[in-house]
Amino acid sequence: MMTGTIETTGNISAEKGGSIILQCHLSSTTAQVTQVNWEQQDQLLAICNADLGWHISPSFKDRVAPGPGLGLTLQSLTVNDTGEYFCIYHTYPDGTYTGRIFLEVLESSVAEHGARFQIP
């Protein structure tokens, strides 16, 4: 039975040219995390695997940094980065948990910041 829950940063916004941390946290389960995938719509951004460590997709290597923890840091944000992001936790024996984050990248210098896990 899947007892865990994923807490995410929810809906967040950031300035164009800035950076943001995407963060998910799996709680209420002692399941073993074997891999975490970060995806943007249907594109794979990065994988953190227990055996092999981090892998960043080649097309995002310049703008995506692993961490902190199992999170992902997006840098040099553009308006095109606006959209949905998913953290997908592969666990044993529970199976797969998915969290959703919506990021809005604003042209304006006044971006409303989410409360949790947000970097200034």
Epitope: Q32, V33, T34, A50
Partner: antibody, heavy 118, light 107 residues
Framework: QVQLQQPGAELVRPGASVKLSCKAS????????MNWVKQRPGQGLEWIGM????????RLNQMFKDKATLTVDKSSSTAYMQLSSPTSDDSAVYYC???????????WGQGTLVTVSA | DIQMIQSPASLSVSVGETVTITCRAS??????LAWYQQKQGKSPQLLVY???HLPDGVPSRFSGSGSGTQYSLKINSLQSEDFGSYYC?????????FGGGTKLEIK
Amino acid sequence: QVQLQQPGAELVRPGASVKLSCKASGYSFTSYWMNWVKQRPGQGLEWIGMIRPSDSETRLNQMFKDKATLTVDKSSSTAYMQLSSPTSDDSAVYYCAGIHDYGHGAYWGQGTLVTVSA
Amino acid sequence: DIQMIQSPASLSVSVGETVTITCRASENIYSNLAWYQQKQGKSPQLLVYAASHLPDGVPSRFSGSGSGTQYSLKINSLQSEDFGSYYCQHFWGTPRTFGGGTKLEIK
């Protein structure tokens, strides 16, 4: 049944490299990372590194980066670890261990006692 | 590198007693932890994987628990064949460090 066969002992001269073998049988050799572990007499276990037989992907403990080289021969289901320039500090039992992804299964060899002595 | 701090280093107990061995990781290892038993002159044997799961053939008196950075191995109603050394090992990235070991001796 599953077996990881290792020579019982190797006597090595200081400075003369030695290649330890570990022959696997009874399980899918390419499905398990082959790990190597060092244990000095009366001491704990030290993880040296691991190699994935399917593609020879290797992860090495940085403490052993100048000491150990891991290879595999898929055709004979055998893993090897070469120890370079052995000194008395390298005298120990060396285990090979086929360990499934994320530690979900483990098959251990009986270990090879390496004695470095002139 | 992740450090694994295992305690106690040694334990003197009687048959029938219950013992608990703990392992603390220097950072979150997300339940990627195994426990091994090693008897004198023999190779280690897997007791617990994924922090709390027992492989086939391991007696149910053994149990593993924990999450995050804190893990423990509990042995209920200790049998004479349980005496030996116990090690934890993490499986979150590399190097896959072992704990320093716990030597379980007969009182």
